[in-house]
Interface confidence: low
């Protein structure tokens, strides 16, 4: 399974957070993405593998990091009223 | 709109260097990945390497490893490929091209014609 | 390396008739569910212009006599129907495995 947290997050503009996701099937590939009103699911980040990682649609104003198989985090270094979103994490072989 | 623009033709004498630019806008360059691109006259394309600007990462083709050295400044939108000891083989037209799509490039600069010549 | 042969070097078509280009990789430029080839196109005197990305996706502002078909080590584009602003070259280009290369190109010419 692939289990995302915080379920629900509510912040300060400019507060740094982190969203973990994580997943126990020896998955290789992990991907971040945000789902907005009339522009459907766009991907943030994707990682292939262990420290491979990669920009997707809308990368700006986010960072990643893949040091282990199981785990992607999801990093907003600066949060900003745009960045108010539903995200999704999703892992593949 | 996204533009790419590069520098002005060089005319350079065999065994120089010389250092060309990219410059982005419409978009942040540390957003995407950068590249270079050489097409020598009536050939072909060939990839010189990329960089990442968000945190100055590259990777070349290994036969440009030691000619080609790519760099970028984000406070300037601008990438840069400079080329060293130059031999006459390499006159040529250097394209600079962004990154996107997983790695297409989509958008390229006009190109910089660079002249090894005595 | 990944090599890339096109195929033919140059091709003559019709106005209005179909075009068809070849793209062979040494190797398999597939991966995680996509395919890693792209196509563009590059009249005289001008750069390269993004046609189709991941093998099938056309381009954003390109018109859709363009489609690229392919997967792992056969690719194709195809122009149908041909216009008179299609003469160009063509190329392939995979981002599948470091260092990505190109297809030698394909001269397109109306007959």
């Known amino acids: 399974q692939v289990t995302q947290n915080p379920r629900y997050l509510i912040t300060v503009t400019g507060k740094k957070l982190t969203v973990t996701c994580s997943q126990n099937m020896n998955h290789e590939y992990m991907s971040w993405y945000r789902q907005d009103p009339g522009l459907g699911l766009r991907q943030i980040y994707y990682s292939m593998n262990v420290e491979v990682t990669d920009k997707g649609d809308v990368p700006e104003g986010y960072k990643v990091s893949r040091k282990e198989k199981r785990n992607f985090p999801l990093i907003l270094e600066s949060p900003s009223p745009n960045q108010t979103s539903l995200y999704f994490c999703a892992s593949s072989l | 709109e996204v533009q790419l623009q590069q520098s002005g033709a060089e005319l350079v004498k065999p065994g120089a260097s010389v250092k060309l630019s990219c410059t982005a806008s419409g978009f942040k360059t540390e957003d995407t990945y950068m590249y270079w691109v050489k097409q020598r006259p009536e050939q072909g394309l060939e990839w010189i390497g990329r960089?990442?600007?968000?945190?100055?990462?590259?990777k070349y083709d290994p036969k440009f490893q030691d000619k080609a050295t790519i760099t970028a400044d984000s406070s300037s939108n601008t990438a840069y490929l400079q080329l060293s000891s130059l031999p006459s083989e390499d006159t040529a037209v250097y394209y600079c091209a962004r990154g996107s799509y997983y790695y297409a490039m989509d958008y390229w600069g006009q190109g910089t014609s660079v002249t090894v010549s005595s | 390396d990944i090599v890339l042969t096109q195929s033919p070097a140059s091709l003559a078509v019709s106005l209005g008739q179909r075009a068809t280009i070849s793209c062979r990789a040494s190797e398999s430029v597939d991966s995680y569910g996509n395919s890693f080839m792209h196509w563009y196109q590059q009249k005289p005197g001008q750069p390269p212009k993004l046609l189709i990305y991941?093998?099938?996706n056309l381009e954003s502002g390109i018109p859709a006599r363009f489609s690229g078909s392919g997967s792992r080590t056969d690719f194709t584009l195809t122009i149908n129907p041909v216009e008179a602003d299609d003469v160009a070259t063509y190329y392939c280009?995979?981002?599948?495995?470091?260092?990505?290369?190109f297809g030698g190109g394909t001269k397109l010419e109306i007959k």
């Open positions: 991941r093998a099938s």
């Open positions: 280009q995979q981002s599948n495995e470091d260092p990505y290369t």
């Open positions: 960089i990442d600007p968000a945190n100055g990462n590259t």
